[in-house]
Amino acid sequence: KDSAPTVVSGILGGSVTLPLNISVDTEIENVIWIGPKNALAFARPKENVTIMVKSYLGRLDITKWSYSLCISNLTLNDAGSYKAQINQRNFEVTTEEEFTLFVYEQLQEPQVTMKSVKVSENFSCNITLMCSVKGAEKSVLYSWTPREPHASESNGGSILTVSRTPCDPDLPYICTAQNPVSQRSSLPVHVGQFCTDPGASRGGTTGETVVGVLGEPVTLPLALPACRDTEKVVWLFNTSIISKEREEAATADPLIKSRDPYKNRVWVSSQDCSLKISQLKIEDAGPYHAYVCSEASSVTSMTHVTLLIYRRLRKPKITWSLRHSEDGICRISLTCSVEDGGNTVMYTWTPLQKEAVVSQGESHLNVSWRSSENHPNLTCTASNPVSRSSHQFLSENICSGPERNTK
């Protein structure tokens, strides 16, 4: 036969039939099936099929009337050329049917990875995404949804380059991988999370610094009087996108809304487009960028705000040790420290003690007084940018008693 081989596709581990068009009333002498390497099987009417290749035992069958070849539990080695030689009774010419069998794996879920981010002019980002399917290199076609004018595919569709500004809607991109036997789609990927500093380091107004207290609310200003007339305002922080569309309550991106750190804690004020955060967490600290958008989704202005977060100080602890007590003079060493104070704590002693030394987050002070003098009552005050806390040290009983010289 001169016609091209019939192409048949099968799934790895599945079954396939190489069909022969032999009618029921055709009188068959025998049919020989030849595989990619050698003869596979021999079939005669009313006789058992003879299988000649060990690797096909238990996996190969020939149907009763049509003599089609059925292979089950397909392996990648089963792929190749198959030929059926059909010998009819009282007919000297052998008829041949050729097949090409392809065996494909069932595709796994495609994985989308971010290859690169390039920040370009006008606060836009070029994000390159790559789609791949584990263990499937050949015969895989890739496509992306949504198909957008500012997105281009390359490398057989496996690579998508998206150009976007923070003002563009953060659409979920889905990669679909397809081979002749299966089709799988990736989880949606929001590209906004990869582009959280477009032009922030270059343009926009000078950054303002806002101080917040751990566990308390804070407002990051946009200072936009005409906020209600603004088409859209987008705040970016790390991989979070918090936006406010005109005539709509401010919403965190669905991606963000479901993520606990920001859930119901962050919103954009519809009054002045400022960003409101309730119950501050340490991880909320950092640079925030606000983009004001036009109707055409272009950035009309941007502002950055740095949020610093400090915790309220606990009461300082004062520890003391007696250096020595002689000649009627009492000499002691005092140490004032705050638990969880961080590295911004400053210490002051009142009455003012100029000799105090701060090291390793503690304030050390040596004091001495004569037994004839009043005992000094000292107060250590620990301060950080959001709170102060004091502890009074009463020294009256430390060196009391006649000629005490204890350490």
Partner: antibody, heavy 122, light 110 residues
């Protein structure tokens, strides 16, 4: 007892800026926090913001954020409040106030300056 | 940070008691025990009368007392005297190192 003395009255044009000073004496300036409060004629008090000189960190009321800058010079024990893009409704008496008591929060307004009248008029 | 709500005016005869309320939200008055009260005579700078809801600075007569319930703070002036006639302002901590004032109340001694 700490005393706060503010700079003299100012007349400004709309769109311009004003910088009011507040000099502290009789206390440890850097240990305390200085607030700025304004009062428009016949109106109530409005907290604008403040600074903690020891840390140099300023805090602002949301309404004034972006338009007000509060600074402090520890060497002269002076705090400054600069308000930009002035408009007629910024006409007010501007007070500085300090927290003399070392409470566990800042901006308790224990001691007040005499106030500075800023008039914005074209 | 919108202002706290106070009555525009209250009045009382000498020797009587008057109470001025100051209503905020759970983000200011209700959230912290950092409510202060200030007295302001015409043309003068304000003077601190009460801090931390109910504490009196030295020099302030004990006729002035403060309290708080939920989102409302109150200043009570007992044994009214002529010199108590003034404007009174409450103020509250409003989170992350910010403060907010009340709208002010004019106290008239009849």
């Amino acid at each position: 007892q700490m005393q706060l003395v503010e700079s003299g009255a100012e007349v400004k044009k709309p769109g311009s800026s004003v910088k009011v000073s507040c000099k502290a004496s009789g206390g440890t300036f850097s240990s305390y926090a200085i607030s700025w409060v304004r009062q428009a004629p016949g109106q109530g008090l409005e907290w604008m913001g403040g600074i903690i000189p020891i840390f140099g960190t300023a805090n602002y009321a949301q309404k004034f954020q972006g338009r007000v800058t509060i600074t402090a010079d520890k060497s002269t024990s002076t705090a400054y409040m600069e308000l930009s893009s002035l408009r007629s409704e910024d006409t007010a008496v501007y007070y500085c106030a300090a927290d003399m008591e070392l409470r566990d929060y800042y901006y308790g307004m224990d001691v007040w300056g005499q106030g500075t009248l800023v008039t914005v008029s074209s | 940070q919108s202002g706290l709500t106070q009555p525009r005016s209250v009045s009382g005869s000498p020797g009587q008691s008057v109470t001025i309320s100051c209503t905020g939200t759970s983000s200011d008055v209700g959230g912290y025990n950092y409510v202060s009260w200030y007295q302001q005579h015409p043309g003068k700078a304000p003077k601190l009368m009460i801090y931390d809801v109910s504490k009196r600075p030295s020099g302030v007569p004990d006729r002035f007392s403060g309290s708080k319930s939920g989102n409302t703070a109150s200043l009570t002036v007992s044994g009214l005297q002529a010199e108590d006639e003034a404007d009174y302002y409450c103020s509250s901590y409003a989170g992350s190192n910010t403060f907010v004032f009340g709208s002010g109340t004019k106290l008239t001694v009849l």
